[in-house]
């Protein structure tokens, strides 16, 4: 493909001096948002060039010299970002008495062979030809850094261009990053992040917990020392050049922290209205155990789910859990402290406490003299109990007489699917107190208000019952 | 932290054989262990827990045919009287939580959650 | 004793695909969730992906999906992938009894 001479054949500008028409040396695609390469010369301006040149011999005519053979000077600097496609030239004339002239490419002193996109194009006139090769790398990559030169061999010798330095720019790359620890909690530590360039400087943002650290950059490469910490965070630094940032992985400071949750709980007895427990303390998280909470809730679908938490020290691992109702089934589960914080609470276990005495007295007590059999007649409802104890197994009734000078107690017990009971008249002419109480296998509970009835003397009756009210009459 | 079986080989009917699991990175006083075998081609069959406190339950089946005991760092299971059956990898295996009943004399297993990689023992004659 | 019972076995699905596997107790489990799942690979120890029917263990992948209460539990796995081919065990233990029973095993077979 033949291409517009993008330059003069002969020598134009001084050599070592940036001209304009040296950019169009460098074709690079204009996409959105690109910026030009830079480049610049290997010389300084003014001086005066004494690269490698070949004197060619007199001509046939033997009266005139032919100049100097040289590559002229091109862009010596090209900058560019990774991924970018480049293309950069050398250019020569070369007096048409030569034949047979090739170009070829050396990167930092090896010869490019093989599949490179190495074009050379031929512009002949009358008395030179231009020679122009091109050199093109598609999506540069760091690796593609370096200085290249043409080379040209003309009756054995050697011409060497200026060297083109291509410098791949792209975003940092860490040589360093920070690594996960473990430290003590408030202990001072040191985090290392480098990463380096092209394009140099490159500054170091750190980053704790997703937030900046240091509001100013530091260069890299930056050591942060955390003066301590109180819980775990993530680290990571950022590394800023003019290409744009890298963010470096996160790592995880792990620090002594809040327990782990007992490995073990153990129920050792029960009773109606406690549980002794023990437990095994997990992992400390390095920081000794201050104190413990077991945590108590009932398991019944008509409990409001409240939980009730007891607070014990640390040592001994063992509590009594009190305040319990009886013939109950709780979920426990066990926590521990220490400096930092509570631990996740156990695994919730299950325990009953035992059965226990009924807490409540039976209802509507009714008591009244049967004259004829000589007795008294008692009457109650079952005990209204929100919980019941234990199994119901009877009823005891305490019957009190008394009259002048005399009191004496008798007890009496009945069957649990009794709701009466007579008791034979004890004394005439004294007053009768009845008191009735229900028994679980628990034990008995509390008796109700005393009912008082008087016993005549034989041949008086009077069939007026006495009674407890019932609840909220009275 | 980690866990590894040890001791299992060929042996003949009836000679007892001791397999052993050493921890690390964690305390036997702190956690509650237990073994488990796997017969050749079969599923998991649990063999027995040792609680941090050294108290010992086993699965009814194994009750009698097996012993489990503990140092401050290993474990041990000794095969009584082994059987051409009792061919199996025995796997030890950390307990994450244990429940213990004293009063009744039993416990239940939360967790297995650190495995060994077992230990094959051949019975044979 | 109690006995968990395991279906189906074998089980398979697509890469991507989803798979469910039940798990049935005789009895209701200790407190109706102590029980756990285990996945074994050929050649390897098992190894814990859910306890308290539904809570992952650490490291588990969210398309490991446990639930269920008392006596019924279930394991899905949803997106499928080939790592997933393994035999799947559930496990759990009751009140009033120290045994520790396992399922049968079910194996998943990732196509």
């Known amino acids: 493909r033949e291409e517009a001479k993008p330059y003069p054949l002969f020598p134009g500008p001084l050599p070592g001096s940036l001209q304009t028409d040296h950019t169009s040396l460098l074709s690079l695609p204009h996409t959105s948002g690109y910026q030009p390469a830079l480049m610049f010369s290997p010389t300084q301006p003014g001086r005066p060039y004494t690269g490698n040149v070949a004197i060619p011999r007199v001509t046939s005519a033997g009266s005139k010299l032919l100049p100097p053979l040289a590559f002229k000077h091109t862009v010596g600097h090209i900058i560019l970002s990774e991924h970018k496609d480049v293309k950069f030239n050398c250019s020569i004339s070369v007096p048409n008495i030569y034949q047979d002239t090739t170009i070829s490419w050396w990167k930092d002193g090896k010869e490019l062979l093989g599949a490179h996109h190495a074009i050379t194009q031929f512009y002949p006139d009358d008395e030179v030809t231009a020679i122009i090769a091109s050199f093109s790398i598609t999506s540069v990559q760091r690796s593609d850094n370096g200085s290249y030169i043409c080379k040209m061999k003309i009756n054995n010798e050697e011409i060497v261009s200026d060297p083109i330095y291509i410098e791949v720019q792209g975003l940092p790359h860490f040589t360093k990053q920070p690594e996960s620890m473990n430290v003590t909690r408030n202990t001072a530590f040191n985090l290392t992040c480098q990463a380096v360039g092209p394009p140099e400087p490159v500054n170091i943002f750190w980053v704790q917990n997703s937030s900046r650290v240091n509001e100013q950059p530091e260069k890299s490469p930056s050591v942060l020392t955390v003066p301590g910490l109180t819980e775990m965070a993530v680290f990571s630094c950022e590394a800023h050049n003019d290409k744009g940032l890298t963010v470096s992985k996160g790592v995880q400071i792990n620090i002594k922290a809040i327990p782990s949750p007992p490995t073990e709980v153990s129920i050792h007895n029960s009773t109606a209205h406690s549980i002794l427990i023990s437990w095994v303390p997990g992992f400390d998280g390095y920081s000794p155990f201050r104190n413990c909470s077991v945590q108590v809730k009932e398991v019944d679908p008509l409990s409001n789910g409240s939980v009730m938490i007891f607070n014990t020290s640390a040592s001994p691992h063992m509590y009594q859990i009190k305040q319990l109702q009886a013939l109950a089934n709780y979920s426990i589960g066990v926590s521990c402290m220490n400096e930092i914080g509570w631990s996740a609470v156990s695994p919730w276990i299950l325990a009953s406490t035992t059965e226990g005495a009924p807490s409540v007295a039976p209802l509507n007590v009714t008591v009244f003299l049967n004259e004829s059999r000589d007795n008294v007649d008692i009457r109650w409802m079952k005990p209204l109990t929100k919980r019941q104890a234990g199994e119901l197994v009877g009823y005891r009734i305490s019957h009190v007489w008394q009259s002048a000078g005399i009191s004496k107690e008798l007890l009496e017990e009945v069957g649990q699917n009794n709701s009466r009971a007579q008791i034979s008249v004890q004394v005439h002419n004294a007053t009768c107190t009845v008191r009735i109480a229900a028994v679980t296998k628990g034990g008995v509970g509390p008796f109700s208000d005393p009912v008082k009835i008087f016993i005549p003397a034989h041949g008086w009756v009077d069939h007026a019952p006495s009674s407890t009210p019932a609840p909220g009459n009275a | 932290q980690s866990v590894e079986e040890s001791g299992g080989r060929l042996v003949t009917p009836g000679t007892p054989l001791t397999l052993t699991c050493t921890v690390s990175?964690?305390?036997?006083?702190?956690?509650?262990m237990s073994w488990v075998r796997q017969a050749p081609g079969k599923g998991l069959e649990w063999i027995g827990i040792?609680?941090?406190?050294?108290s010992t339950y086993s699965a009814s089946w194994a009750k009698g045919r097996f012993t489990i005991s503990k140092t401050s760092t290993t474990m041990d299971l000794k095969i009584t009287s082994p059987t051409t059956e009792d061919t199996a990898t025995y796997f030890c295996?950390?307990?994450?939580?244990?429940?213990?009943?004293?009063?009744?004399?039993?416990?239940?297993?939360?967790?297995?959650?650190?495995w060994g990689q077992g230990t094959l023992v051949t019975v044979s004659s | 004793a109690a006995v968990l019972t395991q279906t189906p076995s074998p089980v398979s699905a697509a890469v991507g695909g989803t798979v469910s596997i039940s798990c049935q107790s005789s009895?209701?489990?200790?407190?109706?969730?102590?029980l756990s799942w285990y996945q074994q690979k050929p050649g390897q120890p098992p190894k814990l992906l859910i306890y308290?029917?539904?809570d992952l263990a650490s490291g588990v992948p969210s398309r490991f999906e446990g639930s269920g209460s008392g006596t019924e539990f279930t394991l899905t796995i949803s997106d499928l992938e080939c790592d997933d081919a393994a035999t799947y065990y559930c496990?759990?233990?009751?009140?009033?009894?120290?045994?520790?029973?396992f399922g049968g095993g079910t194996e998943v077979v990732v196509k």
């Open positions: 009895k209701s489990i200790y407190n109706n969730n102590w």
């Open positions: 308290d029917a539904s």
């Open positions: 040792i609680s941090s406190s050294g």
């Open positions: 496990a759990g233990g009751y009140s009033g009894d120290s045994d520790y029973a």
């Open positions: 990175g964690f305390s036997l006083s702190s956690n509650a």
């Open positions: 295996a950390r307990v994450g939580f244990f429940v213990g009943y004293g009063a009744y004399d039993y416990g239940i297993i939360h967790r297995l959650d650190l």
